[in-house]
């Protein structure tokens, strides 16, 4: 397909990527599916600068990102290396806490109210951020 040269309607351009910020909540997997159907992915934070950009747009609200350890090790949804990459966890996080009483631990990462990261139960209906890089196959999600 043709290359995407500008961001779709209702998406925000920043540093050659496009971002879409939800204003309502979904479970992590459903948020992930939404982004993928838009030829995007849950946001992958690769720098302090990108962290501040996303934080500015989401405000003090729990918001899913594209980081999980549902299959063991922590992984970014786009394959970005977790071990060597940017991290911004809250102190003593991630802790895979089992005390929430919902079954299992905590396998999905989200921005907390101060922007730092926490792991939480993936079924919680948090807001989310989609990201897609410019110069990928073009798609402009329309307005209803």
């Amino acid at each position: 397909g043709s290359e995407r040269t500008c961001c779709p309607v209702n998406w925000v351009e920043h540093e050659r990527s496009c971002y879409w910020f939800s204003r309502s909540g979904k479970a992590w997997a459903d948020a992930d599916n939404y982004c993928r159907l838009e030829d995007a992915h849950l946001v992958v934070v690769t720098s302090w600068e990108e962290q501040k950009f996303v934080q500015h747009h989401i405000g003090p609200v729990n918001t899913w990102m594209g980081l999980h350890d549902q299959n063991g090790p922590w992984k970014w949804v786009d394959g970005t290396d977790y071990e060597t990459g940017f991290k911004n966890w809250r102190p003593e996080q991630p802790d895979d806490w089992y005390g929430h009483g919902l079954g299992g631990g905590e396998d999905c990462a989200h921005f907390t109210d101060d922007g730092r990261w926490n792991d939480d139960v993936c079924q919680r209906p948090y807001r989310w951020v989609c990201e897609t890089e410019l110069d990928k196959a073009s798609q402009e999600p329309p307005l209803l």
Epitope: Y34, E38, D39, Q139
Partner: antibody, heavy 121, light 107 residues
């Protein structure tokens, strides 16, 4: 005119295959995710498959997983559904539908008229 | 998957009357709910999206309300062309699912 037109339905024996097509016109096809939705005779609607605008991401209902494959050719403005290992319970009218994103949901804002698939010996 | 239960299954009303259709979800779907109209031999048509927003070209007599698990489609004054089957659909959780439908028939 903005429209979707399905084709490829017909009578097929159990275990057989069919390939449905959906020709899109009047809008920029590659801008939209697309879905297939089916309706058994006298029954309700059932989502079957979905595909992103580029074709890079696909999803299938558990009832058809491993048997049906959704694909698209954006150069031809056409959506496809390859149906293998067909069963009697796959008998239905198959609609293609356009997925319009709004506030985090994909709503089917444009539908074709459907094509009937009958699986019977 | 989320189960949507529509009631009543059939609604018998006269033109000019008010129709109230219900859709209940087995768990919260927030406002990720749509309503579709389907006439015999035709494809469904999107009426309402995001629980309460009318789709393009839909008359003002159609309105949607609700959030969480309980939703309502209201047709304020039935026109002859409104007699059809109405389906709700949730988009909160994968896979997207539909209710079983409510048939609005002429009394």
């Amino acid at each position: 005119e903005v429209q979707l037109l399905e084709s490829g339905g017909g009578l097929v024996q159990p275990g057989g295959s069919l390939r449905l097509s959906c020709a899109a016109s009047g809008f920029t096809f590659s801008n939209y995710a697309m879905s297939w939705v089916r309706q058994a005779p006298g029954k309700g609607l059932e989502w079957v498959s979905a595909i992103s605008g580029s074709g890079g991401s696909t999803y299938h209902a558990d009832s058809v997983k491993g048997r049906f494959t959704i694909s698209r050719d954006n150069s031809k403005n056409t959506l496809y559904l390859q149906m293998n290992s067909l069963r009697a319970e796959d008998t239905a009218v198959y609609y293609c539908a356009r997925d319009a994103p709004y506030r985090g949901g994909h709503y089917f804002d444009l539908w074709g008229r459907g094509t009937l698939v009958t699986v019977s010996s | 998957e989320i189960v949507l239960t529509q009631s009543p299954a059939t609604l018998s009303l006269s033109p000019g009357e008010r129709a109230t259709l219900s859709c209940r979800a087995s768990q919260s779907v927030s406002s990720y709910l749509a309503w579709y109209q389907q006439k015999p031999g035709q494809a469904p048509r999107l009426l309402i999206y995001d629980a309460s927003n009318r789709a393009t070209g839909i008359p003002a007599r159609f309105s949607g309300s609700g959030s969480g698990t309980d939703f309502t489609l209201t047709i304020s004054s039935l026109e002859p062309e409104d007699f059809a089957v109405y389906y709700c659909q949730q988009l909160a959780s994968w896979p997207p699912t539909f209710g079983g439908g409510t048939k609005v028939e002429i009394k």
